[in-house]
Every structure is written in C-alpha cells, then in structure tokens.
C-alpha cells in the first residue's frame, strides 16, 4: 500500500489526521464497523486541542467516539493507552450504569452536548466521527 498524503473527499484534515463527521446515527458497533470499512477508526481523542476541534465540528449533539469498556477496562479502538491518555469525562462519569432495562451496562463513550464525555448504552443511534492518520499506509494500491 501507499502512504496517504491527503484526505479523502468530504473528510476534514487536522494535525495530520483526517476526520469524517456523520449526519445520521448508528449504534456504537455499527459506527465502529462503518469506520473500519473506510480504512479508519472511531475518533481517538489524545489532546485538549483535538477535543476542541472535534467539538467544534459536531456541535451540541451526542456523538460516539472510539472508546469503550465492553470487555472490562476502558480501551481506545486504536490501542492508545487509556490510563495515561487525555480524558474529558463529565463529573461522576463514567458510571457504567447497570440500572437501565438492558442486561449490560453503559459500555460506550460519547461526546455530550457540552463536549464532555459520558458512557451510555451502546445501542443508542448517536452520530459518530471517523478518524484516519495521514501518515498511515493506505490499503489502496498505488496509482501506476
């Protein structure tokens, strides 16, 4: 594969990453799958600067990110270390609430209307953000 040097059409470039902002909603797993099919991943927020960038583009709308604890500990989908990394939870979150009508807890993280993070039921059809790194090798064959 070749190294991607510019963002695909309809993606927004920022700090050597490309971002795509959905305008419809999907459950977290479907959003995760959508990004993977685009050779990307759900957005991984690594800094306050990136948080502000994403927040600016999504507005005051609940939006999935690439952070979940479906298998126990909180994990970023691209392997970024959660414990030492950037966090922006709402006060008293994440609470992994088990009181709702589901068998499981709130295992997926999203941006809330004020940009801070909350964990919620992964089935809610929230909007989502895909991210891919410009320096990453593309799966597409090089143009001859």
């Amino acid at each position: 594969g070749s190294e991607r040097t510019c963002c695909p059409v309809n993606w927004v470039e920022h700090e050597r990453s490309c971002y795509w902002f959905s305008r419809s909603g999907k459950a977290w797993a479907d959003a995760d799958n959508y990004c993977r099919l685009e050779d990307a991943h759900l957005v991984v927020v690594t800094s306050w600067e990136e948080q502000k960038f994403v927040q600016h583009h999504i507005g005051p709308v609940n939006t999935w990110m690439g952070l979940h604890d479906q298998n126990g500990p909180w994990k970023w989908v691209d392997g970024t270390d959660y414990e030492t990394g950037f966090k922006n939870w709402r006060p008293e979150q994440p609470d992994d609430w088990y009181g709702h009508g589901l068998g499981g807890g709130e295992d997926c993280a999203h941006f809330t209307d004020d940009g801070r993070w909350n964990d919620d039921v992964c089935q809610r059809p929230y909007r989502w953000v895909c991210e891919t790194e410009l320096d990453k090798a593309s799966q597409e064959p090089p143009l001859l």
């Epitope: 609940n62 589901l102 909350n118 919620d120 039921v121």
Partner: antibody
C-alpha cells in the same frame, strides 16, 4: 403497577411557555428514558425528544430544537417538558412515554430494539389568543 | 430524518376480514420498527416490536413482517375492538419518526 401520570390541561396565549409534568411510579425512575410525543387534534403522532435522568442526556427533534427543554427531578420521580414561544399549531395532546432498550433472545449477534412500553394519559395544551 | 409513509391512510372493513397495512421507510431501518394502536381519546398501545415480535397480551391475530424499508401489519380476522388508528414507529435513528397513521373503520 407501572404508571405515568401527567399534569392537567393548560390554556396558553401565543408567545407564552408551557411546562407539562409526568410523574412516574412503580419502577426505578432513573433506569429508563422518558420520551415526549404530541398529537394535534385529528392528526398523527409526532416524536419530540427523549431524556434520561441517569446520564443527564437529552435529544430533541430538530423541529423543536431551541424551543423545547426536557428536565427532571429525581427526588419526586417527575419528568418535565417545557415548550416556549407557543403558537396555535402547538395546540395538541402531549404524551410522555417510558423508553428503554431490550433485546431479542436467540439472535446472534444480539438484536436490540427500543421499547416505549408505558404511556401517560396525555395533557391537552391549547394555544389561543 | 427518516420519513415513514403508510398505506392506505384509511380503510373500511367488516368483522372477520383480513386487513393489511403497509409502512415504508425512506431508507433502510433493519427491523427497528414498532406498530401501535390508538383509540380515540386514549394513549397509543404497542402491538408489535422489532418488526415482527408480538407484544405479550396482544391477540395472535395481529402479526408483523418485513425488514429494511417495507413493513406490514396484518390483522388476520378483524374484531370489533380492532377498529382504531394504527401507526408505525422507526427507532433506527434520531429523531424517531411515526408513520402518518391508518384509520380502520367499520364498513
């Protein structure tokens, strides 16, 4: 048993605000969403939005964005829907409905659906000058 | 937003008739659809969830089918208490949207 009891009928002037309440009983209030749905006389059902008293999350239909606010008071197990800048077209019956995700057994991967299983009796709001 | 359409908008039928109501979504919604019955002056009551699962306590003459964009509610043998308005509701994406309703009247 599980019940949602709504406040009484309201008559408002155009430009005013109305706040409808929905008191829950028979279940853990914070374990479920509350949805608000309205129905103008002789018309169909229109979903306005939802709120969750545990997460603090709300979601409003674009049509009502900026005019509707959904709040709650956990201590008295009551949800509220406030609609501002009222106009004659807002004359309708307003319903609250309990909502939650559940799943079908025997499906792999698990298939989830959203259930609005219990509804309030409705509150009539009339907007007239 | 996902638009829901229903047909017919109203129908006249006799007790014992088989009645079919169709609901179409403007885009694929998997099985994320419920059917509700509403009688005058009353709150809606859910009959079918996940497109084809019967709500407990609802008579077996009601059934639902379909997935993707086309869904059907069938009443196999219409009873006097079934005269009402029927609505479909999609919960695949926010905002949730109802169909415009189908009024089932006595012929």
């Amino acid at each position: 048993q599980v019940q949602l009891v709504q406040s009484g009928a309201e008559v408002k002037k155009p430009g005013a605000s109305v706040k409808v309440s929905c008191k829950a009983s028979g279940y853990t209030f914070t374990s479920y969403d509350i949805n608000w749905v309205r129905q103008a006389t002789g018309q169909g059902l229109e979903w306005m939005g939802w709120m969750n008293p545990n997460s603090g999350n709300t979601g409003y239909a674009q049509k009502f964005q900026g005019r509707v606010t959904m709040t709650w008071n956990t201590s008295i197990r009551t949800a509220y829907m406030e609609l501002s800048s009222l106009r004659s077209e807002d004359t309708a019956v307003y319903y609250c409905a309990r909502g939650f995700y559940d799943f079908l057994t025997g499906y792999s991967p698990t298939y989830y659906y959203y259930d609005m299983d219990v509804w309030g009796q409705g509150t009539t709001v009339t907007v007239s000058s | 937003d996902i638009q829901m359409t229903q047909s017919p908008s109203s129908l006249s039928a006799s007790v014992g008739d088989r009645v079919t109501i169709t609901c179409r979504a403007s885009q694929g919604i998997r099985n994320d659809l419920g059917w509700y019955q509403q009688k005058p002056g009353k709150a809606p009551k859910r009959l079918i969830y996940a497109a084809s699962s019967l709500q407990s306590g609802v008579p077996s003459r009601f059934s639902g089918s379909g997935s993707g964009t086309e869904f059907t509610l069938t009443i196999s043998s219409l009873q006097p208490e079934d005269f009402a308005t029927y609505y479909c509701l999609q919960h695949n994406d926010y905002p949730f949207t109802f169909g415009p309703g189908t009024k089932v009247e006595i012929k």
